[in-house]
């Protein structure tokens, strides 16, 4: 209720002679700060004096000073919330009740705390899980109801007196709720730990023994078994007897059932610790073990491998791989059941013994077609020789051999002919299923392995075929040697290297790219007129009249081919210049006179220059010179000059006559 002081601290604290005690404590006074504090040992209330009697272990004065004899007991609290105490060292006679007498300005309170001090260090307490099973991780806990800042301790784990390798986790608590030291150890027990003693040892800071607690481990586990066999090597021949005995070396709890297994399968009606096998057969070869069960589960012994020996059985051959590709590697494996394993093998190819082959495997690194056939083998061990089995067939596959392309036509072949070719081969495995031809073309294949080229091209130089099964084998190309008329005939200017000017020496060449046969004739023509029969057409001094359209022809025994028409252009300076006058060479004054400079030039005239009868230059540069209004004094001879990139040309003089108008004559 609200009339009480509120305290929080452990109810009882434990320690031993010479150790210390740390009392975590908090409080809340009814009013104001703490003014007086006395720590009593076994306080008793005296009704007469209305005070508490008892041994005073600690007393605080108003000025906060503490008598020197009180150094063993320390008040570590404050005036409003902390009441923590320390007694160091603690003595046996400190056991009993501690009374905390608190006084504020108006209120008083007595708080009681139990202290249990033993003569010597008390043992820790080991806590185990309710059940421990082999190989299952468990946590072992060692708890000690003691912790004090002034007295360090340690907890150590031992198994059969030997420190345990596993790392323990130690924790301490010094709170108003609890005071303890705890060590936790994670541990996976094995069946062999059953019955062993685990100790938790309390030691001081120097590792000196203080006390301990021990427990015996009860590790539940499946039965642990040993198997014994007669004969001890477990190797027998057919008809011999074998005895196997099962012994239980440990079981917790006790075992309940026994059984025997062969190759992992339970043997019926075999539920005793002894297994007797009489007159064994090879089928009884295998791995035997006994199985004994308890409430935890079944336990199995190690396996005993019983070998019943016999002579090899009829052999079979396994081929890796068939069909085999020519040039690849092949491995033959002779398979024959026998015990002991065969020590010697005899190999046969198509019924004939293969010399020097005595191993279980035969390896042929590079298979050839003649390796095909039936392979069989015989196995042999110390008990005898087996029989030869049916054997296995090796199929050797290879590309078609000796492929050739054959021309069926009579020779020579001319451009435009129809050509038939056939593709032949010597042998093939598997059979040829298709043919390929190079180069590809839109050609007919009238039947398998036959190619028909309609209208053969001049450039169909060579043809090759391939016969194909799983692979294609190409024949060497055959030359068609197609004959054709000259091709790509063209006119080429050899000289001059630049543009042709009037008067230049000019050579034209008739070029062609190819001709078969090589022997050719040339013809030159201009405007349908034959000019020459050489490969070159030469002009010593070209004139503008030689300009025009030229063609050349090249022919051989197959036909003739013409070039495209080639235009010969001759550049020349302006020529044949003359001045024409409009409306005529006689004009009335005041009218307009137009003079035109006419010329022949290649390239055309770029500009003109006009001159009068005194060779004076007039400021006009176009083809026409317009005088308006024309005056009588403009009468006279005029001439023009034309200029192009080749040069200049001039006209002869042309006379313009300007006559007086009737008005002028009338005025005179």
């Amino acid at each position: 209720d609200s009339s009480k002081w509120v305290f929080e601290h452990p109810e009882t604290l434990y320690a031993w002679e010479g150790a210390c005690v740390w009392i975590p404590c908090t409080y809340r006074a009814l009013d104001g700060d703490l003014e007086s504090f006395i720590l009593f040992h076994n306080p008793e209330y005296n009704k007469n004096t209305s005070k508490f009697d008892g041994t005073r272990l600690y007393e605080s004065t108003k000025d906060g000073k503490v008598p020197s004899e009180q150094k063993r007991v320390q008040f570590l609290g404050d005036k409003n919330k902390n009441c923590t105490l320390s007694i160091h060292p603690v003595h046996l006679n400190d056991s009993g009740q501690l009374g905390l007498r608190m006084e504020s300005k108006t209120e008083k309170w007595m708080e009681r705390i139990h202290l249990n001090v033993s003569e010597r260090p008390f043992p820790p307490h080991i806590q185990l899980p309710p059940e421990i099973q082999e190989s299952q991780e468990v946590t072992l806990t060692c708890l000690l109801n003691f912790s004090c800042y002034g007295y360090p301790i340690q907890l150590q784990w031992l198994l059969e007196g030997v420190p345990m390798r596993q790392a323990a986790v130690t924790s301490t608590s010094l709170t108003i709720k609890s005071v303890f030291t705890r060590s936790e150890l994670k541990f996976s027990p094995q069946w062999s730990h059953h019955g062993k003693i685990v100790t938790c040892q309390l030691q001081d800071a120097d590792g000196k023994f203080l006390s301990n607690d021990t427990v015996q481990l009860n590790v539940k586990h499946t039965p642990k078994l040993e198997i014994k066999v007669t004969p001890s090597d477990a190797i027998v021949r057919e008809g011999d007897s074998v005895t196997m005995t099962c012994e239980v070396s440990s079981s917790n709890p006790e075992y309940t059932t026994v059984s025997w297994l062969k190759d992992g399968t339970s043997l019926k009606k075999q539920n005793t610790f002894t297994l007797n096998l009489r007159e064994v057969t090879k089928d009884q070869s295998g791995k035997y073990c006994c199985q004994v069960s308890n409430d935890v589960g079944p336990g199995r012994s190690e396996e005993v491998f019983l070998q019943v020996q016999y002579a090899p059985e009829p052999s079979t051959v396994q081929i890796l791989h068939s069909p085999a590709v020519e040039g690849s590697q092949v491995e033959f494996l002779c398979m024959s059941l026998a015990n002991p394993l065969p020590t010697n093998y005899t190999w046969y190819h198509n019924g004939k013994e293969m010399q020097g082959r005595t191993e279980e495997k035969v390896h042929i690194p590079k298979i050839l077609p003649w390796h095909a056939g039936t392979y069989s083998c015989v196995a042999e061990n110390i008990l005898g020789t087996g029989q030869r089995g049916p054997g296995a067939e090796l199929d050797v596959q290879y590309p078609p051999k000796k492929v050739t392309t054959v021309i069926q036509n009579p020779m020579p072949i001319r451009e435009g002919d129809t050509v038939t070719l056939s593709c032949n081969y010597n042998s093939s495995n598997p059979s040829v299923t298709r043919y390929e031809w190079k180069p590809h073309g839109a050609w007919e294949e009238p039947s398998l392995g036959v190619l028909k080229i309609q209208n053969v091209g001049w450039d169909n130089t060579t043809i090759a075929c391939a016969a194909c099964n799983s692979w294609c084998s190409w024949a060497s190309p055959v030359a068609l040697n197609v004959q054709y008329a000259p091709r790509d005939v063209r006119v080429r200017k050899i000289k001059p290297l630049s543009e042709i000017h009037s008067g230049n020496s000019v050579s034209l060449q008739c070029d062609f790219s190819s001709s078969h046969p090589k022997e050719v004739q040339f013809f030159w023509e201009k405007n349908g007129r034959l000019l020459g029969k050489e490969s070159q057409l030469n002009f010593d001094s070209i004139s503008p009249e030689d300009a025009g359209s030229y063609s050349c022809w090249v022919n051989n025994s197959i036909g003739q081919t013409a070039s495209k028409a080639w235009t010969l252009e001759v550049l020349y300076a302006p020529r044949r210049l003359r001045v024409s006058m409009s409306p005529g060479d006689q004009v009335m004054e005041g009218k307009s006179a137009t003079l035109t400079c006419e010329s022949d030039a290649n390239p055309p005239v770029s500009h003109y220059t006009w001159f009068d009868w005194n060779n004076q230059s007039l400021p006009y540069h176009s083809q026409k010179l317009r005088l308006e209004p024309v005056k009588v004094q403009h009468s006279g001879a005029y001439w023009c000059q034309g200029t192009n990139s080749v040069g200049k040309g001039r006209s002869p003089l042309s006379t313009l006559t300007v006559y007086y108008s009737p008005e002028t004559i009338g005025r005179r």
């Epitope: 770029s606 500009h607 220059t609 009868w613 004076q616 540069h621 317009r626």
Partner: antibody
Framework: QVQLQQSGPGLVQPSQTLSLTCVIS??????????WNWIRQSPSRGLEWLGR?????????DYAVSVKSRITINPDTSKNQFSLQLNSVTPEDTAVYYC???????????????????WGQGTTVTVS | DIQLTQSPSSLSTSVGDRVTITCRAS??????LNWYQQKPGKAPKLLIY???NLQSGVPSRFSGSGSGTDFTLTISSLQPEDFATYFC?????????FGQGTRLEIK
């Protein structure tokens, strides 16, 4: 160094005659390697060539079609000048008028071409 | 008449820029083409004559090229005093004609 000095009124009444003179110094109006030109400039028409006079054995004139019926360009050898007369003017003839020498001529053996290298200072003529 | 078309009609540029102005003739005029510079209130000044010849006293940053119908005036590195209007003119035949002009202004 060749110079051209223009003179003439800046204001002309409509339908009246515009008269401008260009005095040449440093060259001769009778030179056989030059032509003497009148050019005008207005915001609406830009630079517009009006005509020219030049001497090559005889005197010659060339006129722009747009003013052919109204224009006269005369050389005056005694004063070494040339003049422009433009009759029947209208406000459309308002412009800055320039005289200029154009180097284009000479003889067959000694020909020159160097463009309009010398210009007068310009006369602003307003018709109103 | 021979028409001369200049492009562009105006151009905003900065000092140091390279500038090219073109002039196209409506028919072939050989090389009878001249270039002029005009500043406000002043008469035109000859820069280039006969398409590619630099007039005496004109800075070498000005150059001209072309023949036939297509002509170019180039200013290799624009100076502050080059902001003006530029005209082309043909003397191939009468009437003598001018281009409409290209105005260069500071960006």
């Amino acid at each position: 160094q060749v110079q051209l000095q223009q003179s003439g009124p800046g204001l002309v009444q409509p339908s009246q005659t515009l008269s401008l003179t260009c005095v040449i110094s440093g060259d001769s109006v009778s030179s056989n390697s030059a032509t003497w030109n009148w050019i005008r400039q207005s915001p609406s028409r830009g630079l517009e060539w009006l005509g020219r006079t030049y001497y090559r054995s005889k005197w010659y004139n060339d006129y722009a079609v747009s003013v052919k019926s109204r224009i006269t360009i005369n050389p005056d050898t005694s004063k070494n000048q040339f003049s422009l007369q433009l009759n029947s003017v209208t406000p459309e003839d308002t412009a800055v008028y320039y005289c200029a020498r154009d180097g284009d001529g000479g003889s067959y053996y000694d020909y020159y071409y160097y463009g309009m290298d010398v210009w007068g200072q310009g006369t602003t003529v307003t018709v109103s | 008449d021979i028409q001369l078309t200049q492009s562009p009609s105006s151009l905003s540029t900065s000092v140091g820029d390279r500038v090219t102005i073109t002039c196209r003739a409506s028919q072939s005029i050989s090389t009878y083409l001249n270039w002029y510079q005009q500043k406000p209130g002043k008469a035109p000044k000859l820069l280039i004559y006969a398409a590619s010849n630099l007039q005496s006293g004109v800075p070498s940053r000005f150059s001209g090229s072309g023949s036939g119908t297509d002509f170019t005036l180039t200013i290799s590195s624009l100076q502050p005093e080059d902001f003006a209007t530029y005209f082309c003119q043909q003397s191939y035949t009468t009437p003598i004609t001018f281009g409409q002009g290209t105005r260069l202004e500071i960006k």
